[in-house]
Each structure stands twice: as structure tokens, then as C-alpha cells.
């Protein structure tokens, strides 16, 4: 089974692809 999605758990339901952005999260390792 193929998957184009890693996880939608943290995604807000958007009305289309026009508002989607790639989010880079910084890890706090201090």
C-alpha cells in the first residue's frame, strides 16, 4: 500500500493545497 502522507495528525484542515506550507520544526536540544 502506497502512502503520500506521513501523518495528518498535526495538520489543520485547509480548504485546498493553496494554503499548505512545508513546516520545519526546530528541536530544542538544550
Amino acid at each position: 500500500v502506497k502512502s503520500k502522507i506521513g501523518s495528518t495528525e498535526n495538520l489543520k484542515h485547509q480548504p485546498g493545497g493553496g494554503k499548505v506550507q512545508i513546516i520545519n520544526k526546530k528541536l530544542d536540544l538544550s
Epitope: I5, H13, P15, G16, G17, K19, Q21
Partner: antibody, heavy 120, light 112 residues
Framework: QVQLVQSGAEVKKPGSSVKVSCKAS????????ISWVRQAPGQGLEWMGE????????YYNEKFKGRVTITADKSTSTAYMELSSLRSEDTAVYYC?????????????WGQGTLVTVSS | DIVMTQSPLSLPVTPGEPASISCKSS????????????LAWYLQKPGQSPQLLIY???TRESGVPDRFTGSGSGTDFTLKISRVEAEDVGVYYC????????FGQGTKVEIK
């Protein structure tokens, strides 16, 4: 395998309501949007609206706002589309489709369709 | 609302010959952040539910024959069939998902 199984054909009177169901299996129901699309006899495809089952969040085609309600029951992996104040122009085949929300935003699996006939 | 316009609306084809369908949107479908065009192509064979052929304007859905190719960006898109086969007959729809969803009117492909 992924399957979307819709409820059977309906005959309704003008002014009444219809509720069509779409039972999903073979994937995690909460992870994908369910869209509803209709097709009048001999006509093209028309998007009605969608629901993200995890949150219950919905978006609707302005044309149907106030007349259509889309809901989802996570416990049974079933989505519903209710259309009210039916008129003869609502006679159509109604499809549910799994929408790859979050990436391709494309409908990769479709139900078999439900014919709704509105007639007095 | 985003309006999708397909042409031609009817396309008689000869098996083995190429075919091309155009789809134009009233506004750009390109997300500059993701660098994706939110345009998909579907085929509805007679008596069947629609099936996904292409998404992101040019990415073939798994299982779709490589004779189907999608191209274009922004507002102008094209679906090409390199060599039409009898099983390719039906109605082809483009659909935008940049904002909500809108389908084109459909292009009926039939064998000459």
C-alpha cells in the same frame, strides 16, 4: 484494500431531505478527507463539500450552503451527506470519494455512487 | 470561485493515434511554497465511477499506464494520451484543489 460503500438508491418528494451514507474500510478513516461529488443525468461532476473526520471540520460549495450537511462517525468509519429542500434538479448520482488531504489533494478512491431521484 | 475550462468538449480519436485535452483555470493553481500545482485529471468510463489518473498536474497515479502524461503550470494544463486505446474512451475531467474543489466541464473521448 480501500473501499467506499454507499447506501442504496432513493426516491424522494420535492421539499424533503435525503441522507446518503458512505462506509469506508481498508484505511485509517480519520487520516483522509471525504468529499462528496454529484452528477446530474448526462452532466458533469460537481463538488458539494468535504469533511475531515478527525476534527469534524467541513468546507462546502457555496452553491449548496444551507442545504447540505456533511457529517462523519469515526466509530463506524462512515460519512454522511444530507441534502434538504430537495427539488427536481437535485436528481443525480451522488458519490463519496477519499481525498488525499495534506499532500496531493486528489480523490484516489470513489464510492459506487447513489442515485437520488426527486419526483412528485 | 476558481473556474475550470476544458477544450475540446468532444474528441473523436483513432486507436493508436495521440490525443490531447486542454484545461485552463481562472487563477494560478501553483503554490509557491510547496512548488506544486493542485490540478488533477480523472477519467469516468461509461457506467463507472470516476478514477484518478494524474495529480500535482503531472504525477501519474499508481497503476495508470504511462501513455497518459500530464503537463502545465499556473493556469494552463494539458493531458496527453500518446496512443489511444479502445479502453480509454469516456469523459475526462480536470479538477483544481488549490482552493476548495472545482471540476472542468469534461471532455468526451470516443472512437471515430
Amino acid at each position: 484494500q480501500v473501499q467506499l460503500v454507499q447506501s442504496g438508491a432513493e426516491v424522494k418528494k420535492p421539499g424533503s431531505s435525503v441522507k446518503v451514507s458512505c462506509k469506508a474500510s481498508g484505511y485509517t478513516f480519520s487520516d483522509y478527507v471525504i468529499s462528496w461529488v454529484r452528477q446530474a443525468p448526462g452532466q458533469g461532476l460537481e463538488w458539494m463539500g468535504e469533511i475531515f473526520p478527525r476534527s469534524g471540520s467541513t468546507y462546502y460549495n457555496e452553491k449548496f450552503k444551507g442545504r447540505v450537511t456533511i457529517t462523519a462517525d469515526k466509530s463506524t468509519s462512515t460519512a454522511y451527506m444530507e441534502l434538504s429542500s430537495l427539488r427536481s434538479e437535485d436528481t443525480a448520482v451522488y458519490y463519496c470519494a477519499r481525498d488525499y488531504y495534506g499532500t496531493s489533494f486528489a480523490m484516489d478512491y470513489w464510492g459506487q455512487g447513489t442515485l437520488v431521484t426527486v419526483s412528485s | 470561485d476558481i473556474v475550470m475550462t476544458q477544450s475540446p468538449l468532444s474528441l473523436p480519436v483513432t486507436p493508436g493515434e495521440p490525443a490531447s485535452i486542454s484545461c485552463k483555470s481562472s487563477q494560478s493553481l501553483l503554490n509557491s511554497r510547496t512548488r506544486k500545482n493542485y490540478l488533477a485529471w480523472y477519467l469516468q468510463k461509461p457506467g463507472q465511477s470516476p478514477q484518478l489518473l494524474i495529480y500535482w498536474a503531472s504525477t501519474r497515479e499508481s497503476g495508470v499506464p504511462d501513455r497518459f502524461t500530464g503537463s502545465g503550470s499556473g493556469t494552463d494544463f494539458t493531458l496527453k494520451i500518446s496512443r489511444v486505446e479502445a479502453e480509454d474512451v469516456g469523459v475526462y475531467y480536470c479538477k483544481q484543489s488549490f482552493y476548495l474543489r472545482t471540476f472542468g466541464q469534461g471532455t468526451k473521448v470516443e472512437i471515430k
